[in-house]
């Protein structure tokens, strides 16, 4: 008789999940020599241990602590780029500006980027059929808790001027319910962080509005100011030109506003 299996609302574990995590770990240590002390088999075992045989709606940050410990990494605290709803451009930016880091440029972020995973209570099986959806099922699922944990730690590590890239094409440029709005903003340390600088990325070619005056940006400024952190905001009117000028700052067209 086939065993009854919980049907969740979200997509199941990404195919080849164990192999992908292990391969990503090895790749990361190959291209980041400073992380070659990491034992990728132990990393996978700790990752697996965080969610295997556990109810996928009952995962805690504590479950991920062994993995967090193994993935401990020092990034320059004044070179952190946060992002919200504009991941691709943020990653393109740190690809060019090699001394800046998004969460996905760290080992743990790189391992889990774009993956889904969950297990089942009391069995060692990975559930490839379905996993809990944050809204429809539960928030304490393996993926959400992982990102909450690593995002909190990443924000806590930041210092001096912290940058955040925000999507100016969305109705809520700053969304209190995003990982940035609900986790990272509240875990920046006022005694270490002097300024949060928002870069609002414009989508439309002819969009010359000052999106730094958007009500949600004003809301972000208010939250940040109340935490005794200064706030500044810049419009990036031409993201394509912005990237090009990061690549080639000596280009004559890069002195004008981007």
């Amino acid at each position: 008789v086939p065993r009854w299996r919980q049907q969740w609302s979200g997509p199941g574990t990404t195919k080849r999940f164990p192999e992908t995590v292990l391969a990503r770990c090895v790749k990361y240590t190959e291209i980041h020599p400073e992380m070659r002390h990491v034992d990728c088999q132990s990393v996978w075992d700790a990752f697996k241990g965080a969610f295997i045989s556990k109810h996928p709606c009952n995962i805690t940050e504590e479950d991920y602590q062994p993995l967090m410990k193994l993935g401990t990494q020092t990034v320059p605290c004044n070179k952190i780029l946060l992002w919200s709803r504009i991941k691709d451009l943020a990653h393109q930016f740190t690809q060019v500006q090699r001394d800046m880091f998004t969460l996905e440029d760290t080992l743990l972020g790189y391992l889990a980027d774009d993956l889904t995973w969950c297990g089942e209570f009391n069995t060692s099986k990975i559930n490839y059929q379905s996993c809990p959806d944050w809204r429809k099922d539960c928030s304490n699922n393996p993926v959400s808790v992982f990102w909450k944990t690593v995002s909190r730690r990443f924000a806590e590590a930041a210092c001096d001027v912290v940058h955040v890239m925000l999507n100016g094409s969305r109705s809520k440029i700053f969304d209190k319910n995003s990982t940035f709005g609900s986790v990272e903003v509240h875990n920046l340390q006022p005694e270490k962080v002097q300024t949060l600088e928002a870069w609002v990325i414009h989508g439309g070619r002819e969009d010359s509005r000052d999106l730094c005056q958007d009500p949600t940006i004003k809301e972000l400024e208010s939250i940040i100011s109340k935490r005794n952190i200064q706030f500044s905001c810049k419009n990036i009117y031409r993201p394509d030109k912005f990237l090009q000028c990061v690549k080639n700052p000596e280009d004559s067209s890069c002195t004008s506003e981007i």
């Epitope: 292990l22 090895v26 020599p33």
Partner: antibody, heavy 123, light 112 residues
Framework: EVQLQQSGPEVGRPGSSVKISCKAS????????MHWVKQSPGQGLEWIGW????????DYAEKFKKKATLTADTSSSTAYIQLSSLTSEDTATYFC????????????????WGQGTLVTVSS | DIVMTQGALPNPVPSGESASITCQSS???????????LNWYLQRPGQSPQLLIY???TRAAGVSDRFSGSGSGTDFTLTISGVEAEDVGVYYC?????????FGSGTKLEIK
Amino acid sequence: EVQLQQSGPEVGRPGSSVKISCKASGYIFTDYIMHWVKQSPGQGLEWIGWIDPEYGSTDYAEKFKKKATLTADTSSSTAYIQLSSLTSEDTATYFCARVAIITTVASGGFAYWGQGTLVTVSS
Amino acid sequence: DIVMTQGALPNPVPSGESASITCQSSESLLHSNGKTYLNWYLQRPGQSPQLLIYWMSTRAAGVSDRFSGSGSGTDFTLTISGVEAEDVGVYYCQQFLEYPPTFGSGTKLEIK
């Protein structure tokens, strides 16, 4: 069996560009970093850069940052190198290469190499 | 960048004798994980390079036990015991401790 099959020889005019390919087989293409190495005629080996085919992220040796562009097509398991603004200095054999994994650790040595593609720059 | 300097061989080497190729790095290649990121390759005439040794002293898969690697943090030796005709070519050392990986200029082995 791991194989890296490179495209055939190319002749490029000074100032033009060439794009050469490296088709991978015998393993999951996105699971490994691909490196490129240059060997000028009768000379030694120079590392150009790497690409992570899964993410498309790249890194280059300083001297090749404006010369080489690495890309990858995951649907065909093929890595590419494009060389721009060709000069006689670019006449060389170009290799793609990959490390071996030894019990979940990258060996740090290029265990698998393509057969090389000779690029000749001539007017 | 780390500079790799290779020594020359007294050429040609008599068949059946041992040959030692030396390589020096401008800084230590010993990683905090205990591994030394020094590789040796052989490039036979008209062929792609072949990995012989990685981590200073570990033979790559399928490589004859006539090849052995040794050394310290900055001074390395590749020893070929009982040189054979198929060993002819150019030997390169390479560091992979940090980016960019750098190669020595190569040491040519010829057989008498």
